[in-house]
Interface confidence: medium
């Protein structure tokens, strides 16, 4: 229904705390360089204005759209052009073009230092002194680094952060309590960020129809007892919610997400038997719980998929009558039977089925033509299954760090033109798939591996799009979203690449490496590994192993030496010479 004042409507629905959090996220995602203090001032002004509209919906400007109100606020920032350059040009436009312009200027890789977690004591002091400001900083720092983070989910992570600090800051050993708990929140949030970026990419590149197909497959896997019409209702709502968040309509998005959770909890009987535990929770936790819900049990009496989609004499008639609905029912029926498949695989199968009907229904004997379609799915199913098997075996053999290195070598050979920091980030993330998925039961491995890899590769595509350097990467990234992972898997050594010259300074290290945390040490080593591969793309596994082993020993030796600087200065050139020789 239409409201006189949209901002008043959202303020009343969301409540002051969530309203302020969402406005802060919105501003931080649009203007990623502004300091917290500047954003919080704007948030307070918007909140005060919203309150006047709640008191009187006819008050001046209360009838304006939220985009207009937010945009006007952002465009009133002094020195906008000095800090943001081209983005200031957006302010010359009218809505909705102005908002579209802001969206286009979101930076997926902003030039911001990595978010450093303060030392435990300091963190607890500032949290206890002002929890609201502390959590506001958290929202701001995450949102500006991840401009597509799913806003209502970020509020949930801030709530988790709050819980952890509340609990741990009363302990005697604060660090021992905080570190593992905050690491777990950080890990989940980072995965959530790449997953949501993939959803926004899907929406931006391929539109609502493609996203809705993804949602139908996902919902059908989770809720196999729900009717097709119920699944499409949920998929339609989820599509709308994601469209809003990806489009910067964060208040509407969060409000609609809460509405969907309410609907699901009121209609458990027609959706799933597993929802009750989620439905007893407060709103943010309820929505998050529903988003992560385990699959309901598959109905025992499901007939073979072939009955309706291969053997039925009216397949072509049903398809012709309403292609989208017929293909939707196919995707629904196939997905609810296969919680063990990735959504990407299910969408590939639906695409194959559609292509088969397009071809066969135009022929003289359609049933004879499409009669083998299910058998033709086999290679499509085997390919990701083999990928999971070989990669999980490699992970079990090498461990996470070793597996990351293997992936780094593979991807540097596939796309050596890509910048080393981007390759290292992608390989580290791709390599985490082992820890995340390979320890799961067999039936959960494939969906975990492939859907996670797809999200990480989407991040690689998003970064590469900004500065395209590799034709092969561009080709894989330009195609359909569900074909991306197979496209990258199929890439081989780039034969067109002219190897990089060997630069001694790239492999020159100093004693500062000794005091780095383990993660940073690993990144330094992996940077060197990528550079080695760029120098010698066809180096054998043994050659690389020798050089990297030698390098690890060198760092270890010099970090234990009494005069570290001297050790690095004298042993370093020897290492470089030995490495050149080993790779000759």
């Amino acid at each position: 229904e239409a409201h006189k004042s949209e901002i008043a409507h959202r303020f009343k629905d969301l409540g002051e705390q969530h309203f302020k959090g969402l406005v802060l996220i919105a501003f931080s995602q649009y203007l990623q360089k502004c300091p917290y203090e500047e954003h919080i001032k704007l948030v307070q002004e918007v909140t005060d204005f919203a309150k006047t509209c709640v008191a009187d919906e006819n008050a001046e400007n209360c009838d304006k759209s939220i985009h207009t109100l937010f945009g006007d606020k952002l465009c009133a920032i002094p020195k906008l052009r000095d800090n943001y350059g081209e983005l200031a040009d957006c302010c010359a436009k009218q809505e909705p073009e102005r908002n579209e312009c802001f969206l286009q200027h979101k930076d997926d890789n902003p030039n911001l230092p990595p978010f450093q977690r303060p030392e435990a004591e300091a963190m607890c002091t500032s949290f206890q002194e002002n929890p609201t400001s502390f959590l506001g900083h958290y929202l701001h720092e995450v949102a500006r680094r991840h401009p597509y983070f799913y806003a209502p989910e970020l509020l949930y992570y801030a709530e988790k952060y709050n819980e952890v600090l509340t609990q741990c800051c009363t302990e005697s050993d604060k660090a021992a309590c905080l570190t593992p708990k905050l690491d777990a929140v950080k890990e989940k949030a980072l995965v959530a960020a790449v997953r949501q970026r993939m959803k926004c990419s899907s929406m931006q590149r391929f539109g609502e129809r493609a996203f809705k197909a993804w949602a139908v497959a996902r919902m059908s896997q989770r809720f196999p007892n729900a009717e097709f019409a119920e699944i499409t209702k949920l998929a339609t709502d989820v599509t709308k919610i994601n469209k809003e968040c990806c489009h910067g309509d964060l208040l509407e998005c969060a409000d609609d997400r809460a509405e969907l959770a309410k609907y699901m909890c009121e209609n458990q009987a027609t959706i799933s038997s597993k929802l009750q535990a989620c439905c007893d929770k407060p709103v943010l936790q309820k929505s998050q719980c529903l988003a992560e819900i385990e699959h309901d049990n598959i109905p025992a009496d499901l007939p073979s998929i072939a009955a309706d989609f291969v053997e039925d004499k009216e397949v072509c008639k049903n398809y012709a009558e309403a292609k989208d609905v017929f293909l939707g029912t196919f995707l629904y029926e196939y997905s609810r039977r296969h919680p063990d498949y990735s959504v990407s695989l299910l969408l590939r199968l639906a695409k194959k089925y559609e292509a088969t009907l397009e071809k066969c229904c135009a022929e003289g004997d359609p049933p004879a033509c499409y009669g083998t379609v299910l058998a033709e799915f086999q290679p499509l199913v085997e390919e990701p299954k083999n990928l999971v098997k070989t990669n999980c075996e490699l992970y079990e053999k090498l461990g996470e760090y070793g597996f990351q290195n293997a992936v780094l070598v593979r991807y540097t050979q596939k796309a050596p033109q890509v910048s080393t920091p981007t390759l290292v980030e992608a390989a580290r993330n791709l390599g985490r798939v082992g820890t995340k998925c390979c320890t799961l039961p067999e039936a959960q491995r494939l969906p975990c591996v492939e859907d996670y890899l797809s999200a990480i590769l989407n991040r690689l595509c998003v970064l590469h799009e900004k500065t395209p350097v590799s034709e092969k990467v561009t080709k894989c990234c330009s195609g359909s979203l569900v074909e991306r992972r197979p496209c990258f898997s199929a890439l081989t050594v780039d034969e067109t690449y002219v190897p990089k010259e060997f630069k001694a300074e790239t492999f020159t290290f100093h004693s500062d490496i000794c005091t780095l945390p383990d993660k940073e040490k690993q990144i330094k080593k992996q940077t060197a590994l990528a550079e080695l591969v760029k120098h010698k793309p066809k180096a054998t596994e043994d050659q690389l192993k020798t050089v990297m082993g030698d390098f690890a020993q060198f760092v270890d030796k010099c970090c234990k030496a009494a005069d570290k600087d001297n050790c690095f200065a004298t042993e370093g050139p020897n290492l470089v010479a030995r490495s050149k020789e080993a790779l000759a």
Partner: nanobody, 119 residues
Framework: EVQLLESGGGLVQPGGSLRLSCAAS????????MLWVRQAPGKGLEWVSV????????YYADSVKGRFTISRDNSKNTLYLQMNSLRAEDTAVYYC????????????RGQGTLVTVSS
């Protein structure tokens, strides 16, 4: 027991409009997705439109998209089909039906109401 009673059919000229109604009883209407199907003389059943229990989303066969609108009033246990820009090929017996999970098949349907489009 499930009962579905259609009404509103009749003779109408091409380009004209009709509104069909279907009164439901014997089951929980507000938790059931519903659909309209039709059967033209000498032809098989063809589904026309589906509506979710909450009223959205709705789906239409390509042949009626943009001309027909399905709606429901859960407080009155009634399903509607607003038919505009009617064509001769829309001539058929229209049935309302309870929509189950499998494809476009359905559990129960009413006795039907005849719509004739002719000049």
């Amino acid at each position: 027991e499930v009962q579905l009673l259609e009404s509103g059919g009749g003779l109408v000229q091409p380009g004209g409009s009709l509104r069909l109604s279907c009164a439901a009883s014997g089951f929980t209407f507000d938790t059931s997705s519903m659909l309209w199907v039709r059967q033209a003389p000498g032809k098989g059943l063809e589904w026309v439109s589906v509506i979710h229990q909450s009223g959205t989303p709705t789906y239409y066969a390509d042949s009626v998209k943009g001309r027909f609108t399905i709606s429901r009033d859960n407080s009155k246990n009634t399903l509607y089909l607003q038919m505009n820009s009617l064509r001769a090929e829309d001539t058929a017996v229209y049935y309302c039906a309870k929509f189950p999970s499998r494809k476009m098949k359905f559990d129960y349907r009413g006795q039907g109401t005849l719509v004739t489009v002719s000049s």
